[in-house]
Amino acid sequence: MAVTACQGLGFVVSLIGIAGIIAATCMDQWSTQDLYNNPVTAVFNYQGLWRSCVRESSGFTECRGYFTLLGLPAMLQAVRALMIVGIVLGAIGLLVSIFALKCIRIGSMEDSAKANMTLTSGIMFIVSGLCAIAGVSVFANMLVTNFWMSTANMYTGMGGMVQTVQTRYTFGAALFVGWVAGGLTLIGGVMMCIACRGLAPEETNYKAVSYHASGHSVAYKPGGFKASTGFGSNTKNKKIYDGGARTEDEVQSYPSKHDYV
């Protein structure tokens, strides 16, 4: 039950996180005009990954896309790439995790297959979250650098325009959305990986009986979930004291998660 809850919660948290990453990527407010210590203007500038916008005090908002690829800063391109990779990985992860959910029965899918899919989706969520956090952090660093370097005629905009009035940009709402969303996706991924450890069929516990292998010559299949980290292979010949009562044949008759990696 706890495993199902952990897996379900991991899925939901990751889903929210990925939705947040998509939202952040699409948002226009990655950087916003710094209003502190500046003359009060009747115009408010803000910029996203795909376009820059100007909101006049009249209420009229005008946005212009960056219709060039080569003319854009490499850092901006890198941020775009990181966010897109994060979204793609997250979307694939969501697709995989739907089929991996313990509460959803698809044909005669083995629990071990579900465990592997859960692990795969978990890793995808972790990488997705890291991509988003990295992308947002790179952009934030770019903003901080430009903020302190900005002078009257310095190029700081995304669209390659010369500034005649010093317009300094600070963190926009999208950065915070991105950081939070990336963190949620990461947490969701970790939860999926934790759930994976409890999903494998070896986890069936018969607490009344303890089975011990006789001798040291018996080679066990790697990946006893209580004996290893769950991510690496346990290749040494050793006893697995996991409280599970099973024969050697039983252990070998089930494919472990490492057979799928």
Epitope: A42, V43, N45, Q47, S52, S57
Partner: antibody, heavy 117, light 113 residues
Framework: EVQLVESGGGLVQPGGSLRLSCAGS????????MSWVRQAPGKGLEWVSS???????YYLDSVKGRFTISRDNAKNSLYLQMNSLRAEDTAVYYC???????????WGQGTLVTVSS | DIVMTQSPDSLAVSLGERATINCKSS????????????LTWYQQKPGQPPKKLIY???TRESGVPDRFSGSGSGTDFTLTISSLQAEDLAVYYC?????????FGQGTKLEIK
Amino acid sequence: EVQLVESGGGLVQPGGSLRLSCAGSGITLSTYAMSWVRQAPGKGLEWVSSIISGGITYYLDSVKGRFTISRDNAKNSLYLQMNSLRAEDTAVYYCARKYHGNALDYWGQGTLVTVSS
Amino acid sequence: DIVMTQSPDSLAVSLGERATINCKSSQSLLNSGNQRNYLTWYQQKPGQPPKKLIYWASTRESGVPDRFSGSGSGTDFTLTISSLQAEDLAVYYCQNNYFYPLTFGQGTKLEIK
């Protein structure tokens, strides 16, 4: 047809108060940024105050603390509450709508405020 | 505050001739975000409220005759009437629409020579 009609002007003594109103027809004032602009007799135009979305207000330094711009969405009206009036506040007061480029595209006919003892 | 200075204060031009009014701001009115200059030109005839002619320094308001044109960028702007008509006799104002307070120029009175 869009129409802005100012009212509430008149003769007032220095230190007195007046409340100017601007009623809109053919236009929903609450959806636009609105401004008050004044023109002293025989002089040029002078921006006085603006109210933008979210109720954010801006004032000319010389009227800050004395004048208050507001609006009543239900009555589709814009107001300028003028307190501690001075002789230099004597002018025709216009209300106008801000539009593209923050430019004032629709103007009322104006209401005359005379501050004199 | 931004100071808007118009020149000349008054201008006498013959009908059919070109009239040029200049406006200089004490700070650049060019917004880097959209590369637009936040300057507006108004026409005011006696006893009437002002009428918007040009916004964003060079965009003509709908319904304004095409003999009116605006140009300039940054701090220097120009309103040009290519062929003066009798109905163009009025006072012309430029306005800073970028920085608060939204200051006006002192006005240029256009007369017939």
